[in-house]
């Protein structure tokens, strides 16, 4: 992995140990918790981080109404099961034999069941909200300029392909951000929404992913954009299946 | 050159611990997995978990956690492995090896015998 | 767990010929770039030795008579000419995910 060959790190994943064992004795670096190679010239899956947050030792100007059918991740951690390519497995059970469905962002989309719950496939997140609302500011921040720059964060801090940036929209204090990545559209190479989307989630929090870089400093025409609060929607390309007990409660 | 040396065998009772060691020699320390192997006759090799050094990052077989415990002393170049609650069944050579797989260097073995 | 099946498990070979010895594992070990298995040797009384790394990639000081190939879930390594000082164990290891499974094993003998 040329990305981490001049000290053997890995630039964008410090969940990481890397040693000069690898092909040709090249630079070599390992998920924690699963011990996956990854590639370090890209961003690491999200199950893949999620394993390894685990194992660590315990050290148009309107806003977005989320559809009926967005999920919020309320489950928060667990220790996935990834599959060969480092993508959550569609089926996730915990050490007591309760079982769910994930979609490709690891959120339940499912009740809980027991061991004989089905998950015939990993359903695709294919439409991401990410909603931030920012600390009070002088005046609000220039709509355009505030567009720009975090499109800019995306394709360069995350390596998102622009186009898959679909709006930033903005109504003071209430910035939301529209990822959309259909499995037609996604081609190989391309960083998933869902791994940017991550990334994100954890630099806004200043638990930054990153090695050795300092931690996210957003500015919009050099006033710092500081997020007081992230809620995330995730829309899977089908439905979730939770029963009527659930959507009522 | 890099050179695994183990510690000398054992003679242990069944309930009781033992603890190996791999001095590690000609190398970084630091800079490198150690693994360990359990080889028990006719049953091949088994993997059993490793170390790195240079954090104490250590990951497991499923089927040897809670048998096996791995440590390492950086100041010494030294990784250790207990064995707890012994049987019979942990009755073989154990093997440390440098490399996370395709170990490059491996060092000569400690047989542990488990006898009443 | 990944599961690598050898085969066969014993084989007995005229010097001089091929020596072929398969492991198949129970999932994909390869990207795009790399494959993530290994093969050793192992002498009566010795640790084992590693001879090939990642596939195809000789370590050095083992004999040019080694080779190594596959992708996958299928690999292959190949001695030839077969030496008298080739009786041994082989084993292929995958270093995909953890636990870094062994295959079974193949004992090689010379005709």
């Known amino acids: 992995h040329t990305a981490a060959q001049d000290n053997c790190t890995c630039p964008t994943n410090k969940m990481t140990v890397c040693s000069p064992d690898g092909p040709g004795g090249r630079c070599q670096c390992r998920a924690l918790g699963s011990g996956m190679a990854v590639d370090c010239s890209t961003l690491t899956s999200k199950c893949l981080l999620l394993k390894a947050r685990m194992s660590a030792p315990k050290n148009a100007r309107t806003l977005v109404r989320p559809s009926e059918h967005a999920l919020v991740d309320n489950d928060g951690l667990y220790d996935p099961d990834c599959d060969p390519e480092g993508r959550f497995k569609a089926r996730q059970c915990n050490q007591t034999s309760v079982c769910w469905c994930v979609n490709s962002v690891g959120v339940r989309r499912t009740d809980k069941g027991d061991l004989s719950l089905r998950c015939d496939e990993l359903v695709r997140t294919h439409h991401i909200l990410i909603d931030l609302r920012h600390r009070p500011t002088a005046g609000a921040f220039n709509h355009s300029d505030l567009d720009a720059e975090l499109r800019r964060l995306f394709r360069e801090r995350y390596r998102l392909h622009p186009k898959f940036v679909a709006a930033v929209h903005y109504e003071q204090p209430t910035i939301q951000i529209e990822l959309r990545q259909n499995t037609s559209q996604k081609a190989a190479g391309d960083v998933d929404i869902g791994d940017a989307a991550y990334y994100f989630e954890r630099d806004i929090k200043g638990e930054s992913l990153f090695q050795g870089r300092g931690g996210l400093d957003l500015r919009v025409r050099g006033e710092p954009l500081q997020v007081e609060r992230t809620l995330i929607y995730y829309l899977d390309e089908i439905p979730p299946k939770f029963s009527m007990k659930r959507l009522t409660a | 050159q890099v050179q695994l040396q183990q510690s000398g065998a054992e003679l242990v009772r069944p309930g009781t611990s033992v603890k190996m060691s791999c001095k590690a020699a000609?190398?970084?320390?630091?800079?490198?997995?150690i693994g360990w192997v359990k080889q028990r006759p006719g049953h091949g090799l088994e993997w059993i978990g490793d170390i790195y050094p240079g954090g104490g990052y250590t990951n497991y077989n499923e089927k040897f956690k809670g048998k096996a415990t791995l440590t390492a002393d950086t100041s010494s170049s030294t990784a250790y492995m207990q064995l707890s609650s012994l049987t019979s069944e942990d009755s073989a050579i154990y093997y440390c090896a440098r490399g996370t797989g395709g170990g490059d260097y491996w060092g000569q073995g400690t047989l542990v015998t488990v006898s009443a | 767990d990944i599961v690598l099946t050898q085969s066969p498990a014993s084989l007995a070979v005229s010097l001089g010929q091929r020596a072929t010895i398969s492991c198949r594992a129970s999932q994909s070990v390869s990207t795009s770039s790399y494959s993530y298995m290994h093969w050793y040797q192992q002498k009566p009384g010795q640790p084992p030795k590693l001879l090939i790394k990642y596939a195809s990639n000789l370590e050095s000081g083992v004999p040019a008579r080694f080779s190594g190939s596959g992708s996958g879930t299928d690999f292959t390594l190949n001695i030839h000419p077969v030496e008298e000082e080739d009786t041994a164990t082989y084993y292929c290891?995958?270093?995909?995910?953890?636990?870094?499974?062994f295959g079974g094993g193949t004992k090689l003998e010379i005709k």
């Open positions: 290891q995958h270093s995909w995910e953890i636990p870094y499974t």
């Open positions: 000609g190398y970084t320390f630091t800079n490198y997995w």
